[in-house]
Structure formats: structure tokens, C-alpha cells
Interface confidence: low
Amino acid sequence: ELQKDSDCCSCHEKWVGYRCNCYFISSEEKTWNESRHFCASQKSSLLQLQNRDELDFMSSSQHFYWIGLSYSEEHTAWLWENGSALSQYLFPSFETFKPKNCIAYNSKGNALDESCETKNRYICKQQLI
Amino acid sequence: ARHCGHCPEEWITYSNSCYYIGKEKRTWAESLLACTSKNSSLLSIDNEEEMKFLTAILTSSWIDVFRDSSHHPWVTINGLTFKHEIKESDHAEHNCAMLHVRGLFSDECGSSKIYHCKHKL
């Protein structure tokens, strides 16, 4: 089965490669802003989820991780770091998220809005292709 | 530096290895065979850093370590003495090792657990 290779080039040391994306799954905790800055320093961004099973390689749901969603007062909407809008199908409860909060997510598909000053683990994502 | 890897689709890459993230449960012996059929080996733990990473993302799963009896040393399937601590239960018949969020533990080889496979690039 190993001959069925992915066409993607692999990721930096200590990053996880999965479906042509690279993920840095932190073991330390930072505030949302600190997490965002760290990801940027690694030429990546806080996780932007394409679908609810994007992290299905993570079977443990013991940790919540900051992801790259924040509320835009200008657009009165939750936006990913690249400016795209949050799909209502991803988190059915997003309308009740408090605009001042940031979003933490775990691999079970749970999303929480928490104070952005709370320290959580975080996931950075880089797309290879 | 980046290098181009050769992992099958739907496997993950991490630090020069490919990992198959299993969802199904098997006994330890069945897990060995399942990984062999995927041209890979049952999950092995090479260092503390890898163990820390795996315990963060995985639930309890078999690793490639066993012993013949409670009087024998823990060895890998390659026959090498296993150097990391395996927390042992009170049960003498627990002769296979599993990765757990709290570290490595012994368990009954015939019990069904999630398994993961690994292939070094």
C-alpha cells in the first residue's frame, strides 16, 4: 500500500502532514493573539477548517485549540484570517458566539467561544498546494 | 528543511515517518498483522518527543512492544530491549504494551484496542 503516494511535498520537522496540508499542533498554551503571531512567524496561519472532519487524524479530544476565527465588526461576521466567512454548517451554534471572544476547537467537533486572553493550545496550518 | 515524502494518501507524516491512524480495534497480534498487510509496522516509539506528540493526538493504542511473561524483559518486535518505562498493572498476563495519554502501560494482549501503523521514510 505504501506505493500509493501523496503528491504533496512533506512538511517541516515537527509538523504533521495530512491531505496536502501541514499542521503544527502545539503542546504549549498561548493567548489567541500570541498563537496567531506564532503561526505567522512560521509562515502559516491559525487553523482554518475546511470541514468538520479535517482533524480526523486526531483521535484524542482531550485538548481545545485556538483556531483562526475572529469577529469582524466591519463585516458583522465571523471571518477566517484570509477574510473568508465562516460556513454556518461548520458550527451550527456560531450565531451565539460572543463577538469579543475567540474560538477554540477540539477534534470531536466541539467549538467554544472563550475569552481571547485564555491560554489554550493552538494549531497552525500551511497549505502545500 | 523540506524534503518530499512518500506516504500513502490518508496517512499522516511527522518527523520522517508515515503513520496510519487506525479507527478500528484489534488484539495486539491482529494489529501486528494488519500493519504488515499495509507494508508497515505496528506503532513504535523512538523517543520522548515522539511519545509526547502521539499522546496529544491519539487515544490508547497498541505499540510494537511485548514480553514473553512477567519474568521476561520488554522487547520490540525486532527483538531489541525496550528502554522506556512501561507502567505495569498487577496482572501477570498483561504482556503487551500500549500508548496511553499518561505514558506507556502494559495490557492484556488479547484485548481489543485501536492500532496505528508506522513506516519510516
Epitope: 484524542s60 479530544s61 451554534s93 450565531e95 466541539n110 | 490508547s60 495519554v101
Partner: antibody, heavy 123, light 113 residues
Framework: QVTLRESGPALVKPTQTLTLTCTFS??????????VSWIRQPPGKALEWLAL???????YYSTSLQTRLTISKDTSKNQVVLTMTNMDPVDTATYYC???????????????WGQGTMVTVSS | DIVMTQSPDSLSVSLGERATINCKSS????????????LAWYQQKPGQPPKLLIY???TRKSGVPDRFSGSGSGTDFTLTISSLQAEDVAVYYC?????????FGPGTKVDIK
Amino acid sequence: QVTLRESGPALVKPTQTLTLTCTFSGFSLSTSDLCVSWIRQPPGKALEWLALIDWNDDKYYSTSLQTRLTISKDTSKNQVVLTMTNMDPVDTATYYCARTIAAAGPYDAFDIWGQGTMVTVSS
Amino acid sequence: DIVMTQSPDSLSVSLGERATINCKSSQSVLYGSNNKNYLAWYQQKPGQPPKLLIYWASTRKSGVPDRFSGSGSGTDFTLTISSLQAEDVAVYYCQEYYSLRFTFGPGTKVDIK
């Protein structure tokens, strides 16, 4: 029959660490999908969830108290232990442990509770 | 975290009459993949631990009298006691278990008018 029983000191001094033990019978935390939580209730006030540990040793903590709490289990003794550091008089409460199941998605409700143990924090 | 609110704070109802308690969550507790509402109701009598009455918003726990019923979906939920009995005097709490933070409401005290 499933039962849970909390034990620990009735009185602790401010700044001390509280250690509470939940001893249970009728189920095992080595069984898939079973979990134990700690919940507290200050006198005359509402319930507050503190922490949960499941069969897989996954742990969850209250956001506001996560820096002070540690939950662990001893499967062979059928016990779950909660430690809470830097105790303060506002932590005076009845502390309960309760069982829950993770059968359909995240986790289920707390179906069986212990009787609770009253902890007073005072110098 | 999800915030749970309950109304009213307290409720006095005549024996045999209907008692209705409302619970609101600050975000939806409906889990899309199984279409279940992760909301429970508990009854707590003085000096006793809470007792689970209703889970999945509307499923009665085995052994709970059928005068207790739960309804609602998403963010708004109701516990109804169709015919109040003396032994129903207690504080009633709603709780969400969607978020892995297991937040409780502040409670509603029910007594007899």
C-alpha cells in the same frame, strides 16, 4: 448497583491544597465510554462543574479554575482524585463526584451522583 | 463558555397545578451529527445531591414520574411538571453538556402555594 462516595478533609486552611477522593463501585473506568466528574456547590448557591476524566484518561477542566485543578484516576482502586491548589474561603462548598457516559457524541448527562462532602476553607 | 440562564428564579404553584421552568443557553446545544440537544434537567432536594430527571432535552430517565417532561431545541428549553406533588418541592437546574464545560443554570426553586 452503581455508587460513588466522596472523601476528603472537612476543613482546610487558605492557600492549602485540597485533595478529594471519589471511590466508586458498580462500574469500572477501564470500560469504554465511562467517565467521572467533580461538581461543587457553595452553600445556598448553584452547581458548578469542575473537572472530568474519562476511561481513556482524557481530562477536561473548568475554564475559570483550570490552573488550580488536577484530576487523575486509579483504575485498579476504582478511585478518582481531584486536587485543588491555593484554597480560598470562597471555595467553601459541598463537593460532589458524579458518573457520566460518552455514548453519543461528546458526553452525556451526570446520571449518578455521590452524596457529597462539605469542605470549609477557614483559618 | 456557554452561559445558561433560567426563569423564573422561584415559583409557587398549588398542588395538582402545572409548573413550568424555562432555560436558555447562550449558544445552541444541538449537536448536528446526531441531531440531539445536549441539555439535562436535575432535581435537588434540601440536603441531597442532584438527581437526573431529563436528558437529551426531552428523554425521561428511567424511574422518573411521567408528570415531568422536557421540551425545546437549540437554545430554548422548558421543564414542565404537569401536576405538582408535595414531593416535587426542590430546586431544578438545567445543564448543557455540549461544550465539554458542562455549565449549569442558576436554578429555579419550586415550592407549594
